[in-house]
């Protein structure tokens, strides 16, 4: 006899990285017929929704209208059908960004390199942080973590055309509180024409939508949860 229901999916809209004082919605998708959803934050009950009519609803939304460092951390959700509870969802790491300062991102030997050259990114932030994150725009979740007193280096090694794209970095004050993003650095890797055509760039987006698509895209996530790449989330753990 089944003792628990399948775990629900949990995600954040527009994104799990939320600028401070901005709104975020935590979505929990379970099953039609669920009479209760519970959202837990850092292990404690945070919110409850009892959708009506339950047979017509399989997703609930928990709003956080004003993101701040107290609201950043790990969330999970569960749901109930009758008296039977689900397994808990995976953990959602909600990160508050735009805290304190803006790092500077630079690249050596430069933003335009030839395939096979060794490339290193440098992220510098003069305030009290020792952890840095380098992120490449797009859904592929290219994330690296680096350490240093005021600067971290991110060696990419010999690059290929797959490395081309737009990069930003953050200083991390703790796992769930990050700085403003650096200005973007676009890495252009030139190679022979055949190779270039085989390595399409990650999707490009207007610069002002940075926060809504970094690491993953809301639409892709909603259409198919299997598309969610856990690289960035796992990095936080």
């Amino acid at each position: 006899q089944q003792q628990t229901l399948p775990k629900p999916f949990i995600w954040a809209e527009p994104h799990f990285m939320v600028p401070k004082e901005k709104q975020v919605t935590i979505c929990c998708q379970g099953n039609y017929g669920a009479v209760e959803y519970q959202l837990h934050f850092e292990g404690s009950l945070f919110a409850v929704d009892r959708p009506k009519p339950p047979e017509r609803i399989n997703k609930v939304q928990f709003y956080i209208p004003d993101m701040n460092s107290r609201m950043a951390g790990q969330y999970s959700c569960i749901y109930r059908v009758g008296e039977l509870w689900s397994e808990p969802s995976n953990l959602l790491d909600l990160v508050v960004t735009e805290m304190y300062d803006t790092p500077t991102l630079s690249v050596h030997p430069g933003p335009e390199v030839i395939s096979g050259e060794k490339v290193t990114f440098y992220c510098r932030l003069d305030t009290a942080t020792s952890m840095f994150l380098l992120l490449k725009e797009g859904r592929s979740s290219h994330v690296q973590r680096g350490y240093g007193k005021v600067q971290a280096e991110f060696p990419l090694g010999p690059v290929t055309t797959a490395h081309r794209g737009t990069y930003r970095c953050f200083g991390s004050y703790n796992n769930h509180a990050w700085s403003f993003p650096s200005e973007p650095v676009k890495l252009l890797v030139t190679g022979d024409i055949e190779n270039t055509s085989l390595a399409p760039e990650d999707p490009t987006f207007p610069a002002d939508t940075w926060g809504t698509y970094l690491l993953t895209t809301e639409t892709g996530l909603q259409k198919d949860h299997a598309l969610w790449d856990h690289t960035a989330q796992n990095l936080l753990r």
Epitope: T25, A47, D49, K52, Q61, F62, Y63, P65
Partner: nanobody
Framework: EVQLVESGGGLVQPGGSLRLSCAAS????????MAWFRQAPGKGREFVAA????????YYADSMKGRFTISRDNSKNTAYLQMNSLRAEDTAVYYC???????????????????????WGQGTLVTVSS
């Protein structure tokens, strides 16, 4: 901006009843989930009960279930906490709270964590003693 003012506290004997009121100013009150919390002397803040903006969904701390009833009248911009079968351990300052007012909340959602609440009243003291 929402301002909250509690009233109805006082001294009551064990087994007695009290009804607390929370009057809100601000046009958005009727769209905001609300809750009552309490803080006993020398202790931390504790969740008591929560209610959705529509009033159609409520949630209670286990120790208050069956004794306390949360309700609201959006036409009067007021929330209530009816407390029955009061015990000495219910002695505390009772606070009402409302969530931030910039989101379109579900009509059935309640928040149980104090960190979710942006607006707080000044509190009203309830003393249960013989």
């Amino acid at each position: 901006e929402v301002q909250l003012v509690e009233s109805g506290g006082g001294l009551v004997q064990p087994g007695g009843s009290l009804r607390l009121s929370c009057a809100a100013s601000g046009r958005t009150f009727s769209r905001l989930p609300m809750a009552w919390f309490r803080q006993a002397p020398g202790k931390g803040r504790e969740f008591v009960a929560a209610i959705s903006w529509s009033g159609g969904s409520t949630y209670y701390a286990d120790s208050m279930k069956g004794r306390f009833t949360i309700s609201r009248d959006n036409s009067k911009n007021t929330a209530y906490l009816q407390m029955n079968s009061l015990r000495a351990e219910d002695t505390a300052v009772y606070y009402c709270a409302a969530v931030g007012d910039s989101a379109p909340y579900s009509a059935t959602i309640v928040y149980t964590d104090a960190r979710a609440y942006a607006y707080w009243g000044q509190g009203t003291l309830v003393t249960v003693s013989s």
